[in-house]
């Protein structure tokens, strides 16, 4: 069976986001993907493939790239120089009509904060990285991290949340990491 | 503990089918991609592709396509890579390796099985 | 496919001295660069990710930098166990590709 998670990323302005969405190949290969943001009840495309799709043949709309893979049955997506209003709920879809759309799996949330005051914000191609490492200290994400998966301390302005509703789990039992780099 | 336990040596003929288990432990199974890369004799590495426990989904090198399957059996942490129509040219350690984060663009293989050795031989 | 070319193919140095391979991708790939370390015999290690963040774990001796198409991986005083073959791999697109390797032997 299939686990359905939202995954939480917590970014600074200035950031860049990068994900990937997978899909059936033999189902979907040659479908337009589009990338989407919830508002309100009404999802708004930001951006979509061409039809169809060809191997990388990116698609760029003002700070978003699409590149889909139709080969390896992957889109991949990235979000340039975050800022705090890019905050909310994403999503990857497999594009049939503007009132039909196929959600692929894991919705994003993006939280994108100011960054500390006397700091200037990170290069346009800062990038936060999901990772792993043995734990040292959960600290920095404090009480409200609920995820089956990793925690750490991460590195000054950057942290990551991956959480899965319904499933809090104490910090003193995570034996996994996210570390999130910051590139200056 | 976290590893990575793949299946054993293997001898194939030409033409035939290898199927290489490798068997997650110590951490979420379905939260991280699994790839696999190959290494022939006195050679570098090469990613055949990838999988997404999770979804099931998975995508290889054109060099494959059609040749290699990915599967998984989440109950029990195990992922498979099946390749077939074997040649000699085949012969090498198959390794699977633990990816990022299944939706974040991460490609570190930050955790490997130790290798099956598949020898394709007449 | 993204080009990863490695340089030298093969080296020899003497314990402590300082040591660099370098890493050229035939287009930009920014810092989706990883370096990993792999004994005879034995599966490969990662070592360095996202071109200078070095994994944990892993010896303060080995570093990592550059970004676009340029990299250079560091060892800053050699150690009789690092005698390995040494690898970059890049993840800007699919597919990833490694580097050929770098055979390091102690002089």
């Known amino acids: 069976t299939t686990e359905l998670t939202e995954e939480k990323y917590e970014y600074k302005e200035g950031q860049t986001l990068e994900v990937k969405c997978d899909y059936a190949l033999e189902k979907y290969a040659n479908s337009r993907k589009a990338w989407q943001k919830m508002e309100g009840k009404m999802p708004k495309i930001l951006a979509k493939t061409e039809r169809p799709s060809e191997n990388s043949h990116p698609v760029q709309v003002g700070r978003i790239t699409l590149e889909d893979y139709p080969d390896h049955g992957l889109l991949q997506v990235r979000m340039t120089n975050l800022q705090v209003e890019d905050s909310g709920l994403y999503q990857c879809v497999i594009y049939q009509h503007p009132k039909e759309s196929h959600v692929l799996f894991n919705p994003i949330c993006l939280v994108v904060t100011k960054g500390s005051s006397g700091t200037p914000g990170s290069s346009e191609n800062s990038t936060q990285n999901v990772y792993r490492t043995p734990s040292t200290t959960a600290k920095a994400l404090g009480p409200r991290y609920t995820s089956p998966r990793t925690v750490t301390q991460a590195p000054p302005e950057s942290t990551v949340v991956v959480s899965t509703p319904g499933s809090e789990i104490n910090l003193t039992n995570v034996t996994d990491i996210i570390r999130v780099p910051v590139f200056n | 503990q976290v590893q990575l336990v793949q299946s054993g040596a293997e001898v194939k003929k030409p033409g035939a089918s290898v199927k290489v288990s490798c068997k997650a432990s110590?951490?979420?199974?379905?939260?991280?991609?699994i790839n696999w890369v190959r290494q022939a004799t006195g050679q570098g590495l090469e990613w055949m592709g990838w999988m997404n426990p999770n979804s099931g989904n998975s995508g290889s090198v054109q060099k494959f396509r059609g040749r290699v399957t990915m599967t998984r059996n989440t109950s029990i942490h195990i992922a498979y890579m099946e390749l077939s129509s074997l040649r000699s040219e085949d012969t090498a350690v198959y390794y699977c390796a633990r990816g990022g984060y299944t939706s974040s663009w991460r490609w570190y293989f930050d955790l490997w099985g130790r290798g099956t050795l598949v020898t394709v031989s007449s | 496919d993204i080009q990863m070319t490695q340089s030298p193919s093969s080296l020899s140095a003497s314990v402590g001295d300082r040591v660099n391979i370098t890493c050229q991708a035939s287009q930009d790939i920014r810092k989706h660069l990883n370096w990993y370390q792999q004994k005879p015999g034995k599966a490969p290690n990662l070592l360095i990710y996202?071109?200078?963040n070095l994994e944990t774990g892993v010896p303060s001796r080995f570093s990592g930098s550059g970004s676009g198409t340029a990299f250079t991986f560091t060892i800053s005083s050699l150690q009789p166990e690092d005698i390995a073959t040494y690898y970059c791999?890049?993840?800007?697109?699919?597919?990833?590709?490694f580097g050929q390797g770098t055979r390091l032997e102690i002089k």
């Open positions: 791999q890049h993840y800007a697109n699919l597919p990833i590709t």
């Open positions: 110590g951490y979420t199974f379905t939260r991280y991609d």
């Open positions: 996202d071109a200078a």
